[in-house]
């Protein structure tokens, strides 16, 4: 059973390479349909003419682009994660909402609130949620700062979620935090307004606790500019979830091999 | 090229299972020798009689036991990581050393200093270092606390390395922090005393910044007890490195395939 | 998952992790590894069927991609998914050494 | 590593990641995926030699375990190591959907 060193992909074997390519292409045909739980390609009869809506393209681009802090590791794939996940996004509650009033004059943090009912529209049952990322667009900055993310926990308490060392940048940069567990918790708790706090890292002996990072759609000096592009760039939750109908199909047709 | 569902490991194929087991066993023989860079098993002529020294067993057990904070993920394996790593441990500088004097009355942190020359004995060249873990034994505790680890950076500055949420525990518990990059830095900087700070997480508006966690071999109330067992349990660096002689062999015989 | 929990307690015929304990003395004839005396190495074995669609059962094939060819390989193979390291103690001359060998224990398998 | 950087720029005969661009329209005859138009799927191919020791070249075999049978498999296979997801846009009726498909792009391979 010893394979000799000369057992190579020699020129006489180019036909093999073509065969393998054809097989791989056919396997991908099956893989994509299988991941989408489709027995055949979907009908295109009702597809509206013209280009894709801008919001859909923006969502596609958000999903495609790797952003700072997002893990690029190959994901291990439990059974449910094999299937395709629908991607949606939920923008944070508008900055003009009264809920932000009492957070205005705090220099060490910025706050982002979300309406759980918006999230539930995208994810009707909590176990369907596969991943949730909080995405923030950081504006260009010449300073380095160590920042932290907290989850609103109870009336006046915050639970630490994670941190990041932000280095200077010449261009706006998207940041991503994995908040899957938090969003699942929110869904488990019923409806309401829930939030995150993005803070300077305050060390035990530090004097300057001011947050020097500016976030698109939040930082005060840009609050007047609420145009569409800007609005698309305000903090949002990127949600990946199994669509309800696929989950039901997946469950009813599942059997042990 | 379609494989039928009946292509199973049927009883008629039990011989295959035995053959595969034999092949796997033979492959493991080669794998272990290969990882140790041995052409044949080492001679046992000079091995001293009697059981293994206690310190060696303790080191073996430290390596074998998974501890809180240590990643249990399958490690991806770059070429150099294929080969076996020698495991050694370097205890922190004794608490009676004068270097700890000025850190005595700080309530938010505890300090651990290491002598780079001790580390260099185990790892003569920085590139040989494959992994370094800081291991601390936390004593039993009824409180939850969010803690942070810092690296001594310059005279009076500290660089943030990581954090952990420590939940109450009924028994002493080992904590592990990956400090590979830090130790490699130390080795690159030449000899001297280097250190870590283990601190309470001080939030921007927190009042109580006291560290409530007690670490074996550091916490004041147990400072008198410096018996052997206790000493083995004081903070240490667990180092994994390619032995120098193996690295030289590895380098001289390496070739692109 | 095709891990030890599932595979060791089932009679799965397809790709799964199989039990294999290696006793250094008995199986390899080695006395030079002082600790451990042996270890659960395990291995992956079993076919990864349903690779190519036969038109007659295309939907059946699609439903089984998940288990049998999740990576859409041209010829999937039953291979290790999660591996764990093994520390050993042995002597070089009079000096005992503790060394860690990476990726020695197979915890789960997959069709890849 | 047997990744796109190394494999695409060499003529490696053994296990390596091979280039394969899938054009949904041309290769699969599909018009229903609106974005992307195609993607670099790639695949793994090539033998994992030096599996069993011939006594005559035992030390040569040992030196090559690293590349050709690092997991000490009974019959090693050239399989994906690092995989990446692919987002797509398609319509269900009149409604556009963005979905993410996991483990679609092969970035590197290994003998396993």
């Amino acid at each position: 059973d010893y394979k000799d060193d000369d057992d190579k992909l020699s020129t006489s074997k180019t036909i093999d390479m073509e065969l393998v390519k054809r097989k791989r292409i056919e396997a991908i045909r099956g893989q994509i349909l299988s991941k989408l739980r489709l027995a055949s390609p979907p009908s295109q009869g009702e597809v509206p003419p013209g280009p894709l809506p801008e919001a859909v393209l923006a969502l596609y681009n958000s999903t495609r682009d790797r952003v700072a802090g997002e893990s690029a590791d190959p994901e291990p794939e439990p059974e449910a994660d094999y299937y395709a996940k629908e991607v949606t996004r939920v923008l944070m509650v508008d900055r003009n909402n009264a809920i932000y009033e009492k957070t205005k004059d705090i220099s060490h943090s910025i706050y982002m609130f979300f309406n759980t009912s918006d999230i539930r529209e995208a994810v009707p049952e909590p176990p369907l949620l596969s991943r949730a990322e909080l995405r923030l667009q950081r504006l260009k900055s010449s300073v380095e700062q160590h920042v932290e993310l907290y989850q609103k926990y109870s009336n006046n308490s915050w639970r630490y979620l994670g941190n990041r060392l932000l280095t200077p940048t010449d261009t706006p940069e998207w940041l991503s935090f994995d908040v899957t567990g938090v969003v699942r918790q929110w869904l488990n708790q019923g409806d309401g307004i829930q939030g995150f706090r993005f803070s300077a890292h305050c060390s035990c002996d530090s004097k300057d606790n001011k947050l020097h990072v500016e976030i698109n759609g939040i930082s005060p000096k840009r609050r007047g500019d609420l145009g569409t592009i800007h609005d698309m760039n305000r903090p949002f939750l990127l949600l990946m979830a199994t669509p309800l109908e696929r989950a039901q199909h997946l469950h009813s047709s599942r059997h042990r091999r | 090229d379609y494989k039928d569902d009946d292509d199973k490991l049927s009883t008629s194929k039990t011989i295959d299972m035995e053959l595969v087991k034999r092949k796997r066993i033979e492959a493991i023989r080669g794998q272990i020798l290969s990882k140790l860079r041995l052409a044949s098993p080492p001679s046992q002529g000079e091995v001293p009689p009697g059981p293994l020294p206690e310190a060696v067993l303790a080191l073996y057990n430290s390596t074998r036991d998974r501890v809180a904070g240590e990643s249990a993920d399958p490690e991806p394996e770059p070429e150099a990581d294929y080969y076996a790593k020698e495991v050694t441990r370097v205890l922190m500088v004794d608490r009676n050393n004068a270097i700890y004097e000025k850190t005595k009355d700080i309530s938010h942190s505890i300090y651990m200093f290491f002598n780079t020359s001790d580390i260099r004995e185990a790892v003569p060249e920085p590139p040989l270092l494959s992994r370094a873990e800081l291991r601390l034994q936390r004593l039993k505790s009824s409180v939850e606390q969010h803690v942070e680890l810092y690296q001594k950076y310059s005279n009076n500055s500290w660089r943030y390395l990581g954090n952990r949420l420590l939940t109450p525990t009924d028994t002493p518990e080992w904590l592990s922090f990956d400090v590979t990059g830090v130790v490699r830095q130390w080795l690159n900087q030449g000899d001297g005393i280097q250190g870590f700070r283990f601190s309470a997480h001080c939030s921007c508006d927190s009042k109580d910044n006291k560290l409530h966690v007690e670490i074996n071999g550091i916490s004041p109330k147990r400072r008198g007890d410096l018996g052997t067992i206790h000493d083995m349990n004081r903070p240490f660096l667990l180092l994994m490195a390619t032995p120098l002689e193996r690295a030289q062999h590895l380098h001289s015989s390496r070739h692109r395939r | 998952a095709l891990d030890t929990n599932y595979c060791f307690s089932s009679t799965e015929k397809n790709c799964c992790v199989r039990q294999l304990y290696i006793d250094f003395r008995k199986d390899l004839g080695w006395k030079w590894i002082h600790e451990p005396k042996g270890y659960h190495a395990n291995f992956c074995l079993g076919p990864c069927p349903y690779i190519w669609s036969l038109d007659t059962q295309y939907s059946k094939v699609l439903a089984l991609y998940n288990q049998h060819n999740p990576g859409a390989s041209a010829s999937p193979c039953c291979v290790p998914q999660a591996l764990e390291p093994l520390p050993i103690v042995y002597y070089v001359g009079r000096k005992p050494k503790v060394e860690q060998l990476s990726n020695m224990i197979v915890r789960s398998c997959k069709c890849s | 590593a047997l990744d796109t950087n190394y494999c695409f720029s060499s003529t490696e005969k053994n296990c390596c990641v091979r280039q394969l661009y899938i054009d949904f329209r041309k290769d699969l005859g599909w018009k229903w995926i609106h974005e992307p138009k195609g993607y670099h799927a790639n695949f793994c191919l090539g033998p994992c030699p030096y599996i069993w020791s011939l006594d005559t070249q035992y030390s040569k075999v040992l030196a090559l375990y690293n590349q050709h049978n690092p997991g000490a498999s009974a019959s090693p296979c050239c399989v994906p190591q690092a995989l990446e997801p692919l987002p797509i846009v398609y319509y269900v009726g009149r409604k556009p959907k963005v979905e993410q498909l996991s483990n679609m792009i092969v970035r590197s391979c290994k003998c396993s």
Partner: antibody
Framework: QSLEESGGRLVTPGTPLTLTCTTS????????MNWVRQAPGKGLEWIGL?????TTYYANWAKGRFTVSKTSTTVDLKMTSPTTEDTATYFC??????????WGPGTLVTVSS | AYDMTQTPASVEVAVGGTVTIKCQAS??????LAWYQQKPGQPPKQLIY???TLASGVSSRFKGSGSGTQFTLTISGVECADAATYYC????????????FGGGTKVEIK
């Protein structure tokens, strides 16, 4: 795919007891795992659950009296200090909200002095 | 809290008749509701999930409807085998609750 509860027995008040739900054929990471009880002749009473991430939720009356935890294939219910009112059949339930759930056959706990 | 109130507590019905059981949530739970049937000495059997989706293997004589706070289980063409206790359950929220189940409705056949 199945669930089976075990550990139910006769205990005296105040004696801690752990019930175990052993699962097979599915991954616990994809489901919410609940404990539900039913006293003789009474209705169903939800005790608590552990979600995909291992986060636990409890009924108000169960907080401090019960602890739910899970491993890769089992879900435990620890009764810290049972009283006679805790006499019931205890069920382990796999729930996804969006699909048919799965119940174990139940295990009987009798608390009596 | 999301409290579930089930009515009636018991009902008697003739073979071939129709039974309607109601379940009211104290706050909106969208469509996150399930219905169960339980016979003595057995674990409950799920009939309906997501308010109106019939679980596999369940007779189409069972019908679930409603959303928000008002839900109904209707059993038409009642058979002797339908004698059991029926429960509703919300799966909308798991925090700060006393129970996720309704109190139950005992269905007896005349």
């Amino acid at each position: 795919q199945s669930l089976e509860e075990s550990g139910g027995r006769l205990v005296t008040p105040g004696t801690p007891l752990t019930l175990t739900c052993t699962t097979s054929g599915f991954s616990l990471n994809n489901y919410y795992m609940n404990w539900v009880r039913q006293a003789p002749g009474k209705g169903l009473e939800w005790i608590g659950l552990t979600d995909n991430d291992g986060t636990t939720y409890y009924a108000n009356w169960a907080k401090g009296r019960f602890t739910v935890s899970k491993t890769s294939t089992t879900v435990d219910l620890k009764m810290t200090s049972p009283t006679t009112e805790d006499t019931a059949t205890y069920f382990c339930v796999r729930d996804a909200g969006y699909s048919r759930n799965l119940w174990g056959p139940g295990t009987l706990v009798t608390v009596s002095s | 809290a999301y409290d579930m109130t089930q009515t009636p507590a018991s009902v008697e019905v003739a073979v071939g008749g129709t039974v309607t059981i109601k379940c009211q949530a104290s706050q909106s739970i969208s469509s996150s509701l399930a219905w169960y049937q339980q016979k003595p000495g057995q674990p409950p059997k799920q009939l309906i999930y997501r308010a109106s989706t019939l679980a596999s293997g369940v007779s189409s004589r069972f019908k679930g409807s409603g959303s928000g706070t008002q839900f109904t289980l209707t059993i038409s063409g009642v058979e002797c085998a339908d004698a059991a206790t029926y429960y509703c359950q919300q799966t909308y929220s798991w925090s700060g609750l006393d129970n996720v189940f309704g109190g139950g409705t005992k269905v007896e056949i005349k």
